[in-house]
Interface confidence: low
Amino acid sequence: RAPRCRELPAQKWWHTGALYRIGDLQAFQGHGAGNLAGLKGRLDYLSSLKVKGLVLGPIHKNQKDDVAQTDLLQIDPNFGSKEDFDSLLQSAKKKSIRVILDLTPNYRGENSWFSTQVDTVATKVKDALEFWLQAGVDGFQVRDIENLKDASSFLAEWQNITKGFSEDRLLIAGTNSSDLQQILSLLESNKDLLLTSSYLSDSGSTGEHTKSLVTQYLNATGNRWCSWSLSQARLLTSFLPAQLLRLYQLMLFTLPGTPVFSYGDEIGLDAAALPGQPMEAPVMLWDESSFPDIPGAVSANMTVKGQSEDPGSLLSLFRRLSDQRSKERSLLHGDFHAFSAGPGLFSYIRHWDQNERFLVVLNFGDVGLSAGLQASDLPASASLPAKADLLLSTQPGREEGSPLELERLKLEPHEGLLLRFPYAA
């Protein structure tokens, strides 16, 4: 008799793929644009990335450090009108892209939460949640919650409002903290909260260190759904050298949870390569004319246009990984098992019931080395075969689809491999 199929878990929309943050509309659109109407014209691009949600803004009225002149119910006219926002929501829905609104109150000021008037601000947030839920948004983000006194209780209250409206609505909280205990204390009282933090921001050193960070986090959070990013708002290049960007894309897309990216992560956008551009929100490089005032600063391979035409580019890798992440059961909600491998390596398996299984091997080091996979670490339900098919490598030159002997697997410096193999009873 065939073994019984495992019952599928309940899947919310944010479980099915990546979220894409656009914190600065003007920098994202460039060319003197930067409003909601212009963003609507970029939704096809977001669709091509196969992302499931757009984390937008903040876009509300906020006069720096002035509570009275901060209105979470009003869109700053520089970004457009309520009608523009409604139109964006409708277009996004047609393309199956959910819209999450950032309501961090004092986003233009020194303290995001007006430290002296916490209760006033909390009331404003509550009113705003109800208003924007009625308007049709799919969720909310609040950042810098380490600056919010009694954050846990406020988040619990805001979560109740959000979930009370619909279980299909999401609340994201962001913190600059990288301390696991602080992160856990925020998560403790808030079931279903998606938390972005700087937890992984110092993970770039070695595979062993990354493995221990990831496994500690997953063990500590139990069976709750996680999100994966390197910070609550910043670009990957704020933390990583260029040679690790592909490796991290592969990792973020294949860990159990929701990967969260900032605009530009898909092309390796880096402020230091763009004279005069701010670290937190450099102008998005759509093509070579996106940064017109400094001739020669931008080459084609730094842009969306250039990378779209190159199957070996970071953007092409992002699109492929995003596509795999959104359609393979083992990557959508499969079990995760990390296991030992050679020095500088992080390797793990993702599997769900009788579906196709995935092996990820990441070489964080700058030397090529044999994988030396220790399958003895794995439970019987997740055993490794002798061979697995290469789905993709982060480096050019390997023949995709070819079976690789796991015993003899060797990785190039900074190479990541995604391999697939069938379930075997």
């Epitope: 003007q26 003197g32 644009a33 600059n176 921001s201 704020s238 933390f239 004279p275 670290m279 937190e280």
Partner: antibody
């Protein structure tokens, strides 16, 4: 808020090298670009180069290419600038600065004296 | 490279009087896509590192007294000290942060008359 503390004054012989350090504390090291600026005695300010400590990407003033090498170590939140083939005209105070674009935070400066 | 020219080289002003320093760029510092001027002003006292006063040509850094103000757009910029105090004696520099290499003006020394 970020505090930048630089290494102490150095006296060097012509032709030698010197490595000046700049240790950041306070805010996250990777939140800032680290810039290096020099000021010769009685002179104005001259921008030398910049590093993004997160990605390691650098940009140099043409004038200092081959003369200065800027690096950063995220694990110790420290940026470095090494000057090679020192000459008497390299005698100056060297400042590191934490910036987004403008130079918001400055180290106290390191005086490098090149003298035979 | 873009050249930043400051004038005058030095300036002697009575306490309580207005001091005005000019800075001219050989190329526009106004960036079309965000309509911001990529210019900053610094104050440097003897034996100290420079201190940021103004960025985006007219935004005062936190903690900077409101007697300091910046104005101008494109290629011509001004730093004004509306009522000179004894502690304002220093050298003032403008700096462009638009396109590498960043460049500074030659500096203006402000003294008390």
């Amino acid at each position: 808020q970020v505090q930048l503390v630089q290494s102490g004054a150095e006296v060097k012989k012509p032709g030698s090298s010197v490595k000046v350090s700049c240790k950041a504390s306070g805010n996250a090291f990777t939140n800032y670009l680290i810039e290096w600026v020099r000021q010769a005695p009685g002179q104005g300010l001259e921008w030398m180069g910049v590093i993004n400590p997160g990605s390691g990407i650098t940009n140099y003033n043409e004038k200092f290419k081959g003369k200065a090498t800027i690096t950063a170590d995220k694990s110790t939140s420290t940026a470095y600038m090494e000057l090679s083939s020192l000459r008497s005209e390299d005698t100056a105070v060297y400042y590191c600065s934490g910036s987004a674009n403008w130079f918001a935070y400055w180290g106290q400066g390191t005086l490098v004296t090149v003298s035979s | 490279d873009i050249v930043m020219t400051q004038s005058p080289d030095s300036l002697a002003v009575s306490l309580g009087e207005r001091a005005t320093i000019n800075c001219k760029s050989s190329q526009s510092l106004l960036y079309s896509s965000n309509q911001k001027n990529y210019l900053a002003w610094y104050q440097q006292k003897p034996g100290q590192p420079p201190k940021l006063l103004i960025y985006w040509a007219s935004t005062r850094d936190s903690g900077v007294p409101d007697r300091f103000s910046g104005s101008g757009s494109g290629t011509d910029f001004t730093l004004t000290i509306s009522s000179l105090q004894a502690e304002d004696v220093a050298v003032y520099y403008c700096q462009r942060y638009y396109g590498y290499p960043w460049t500074f003006g030659g500096g203006t020394k402000v003294e008390i008359k």
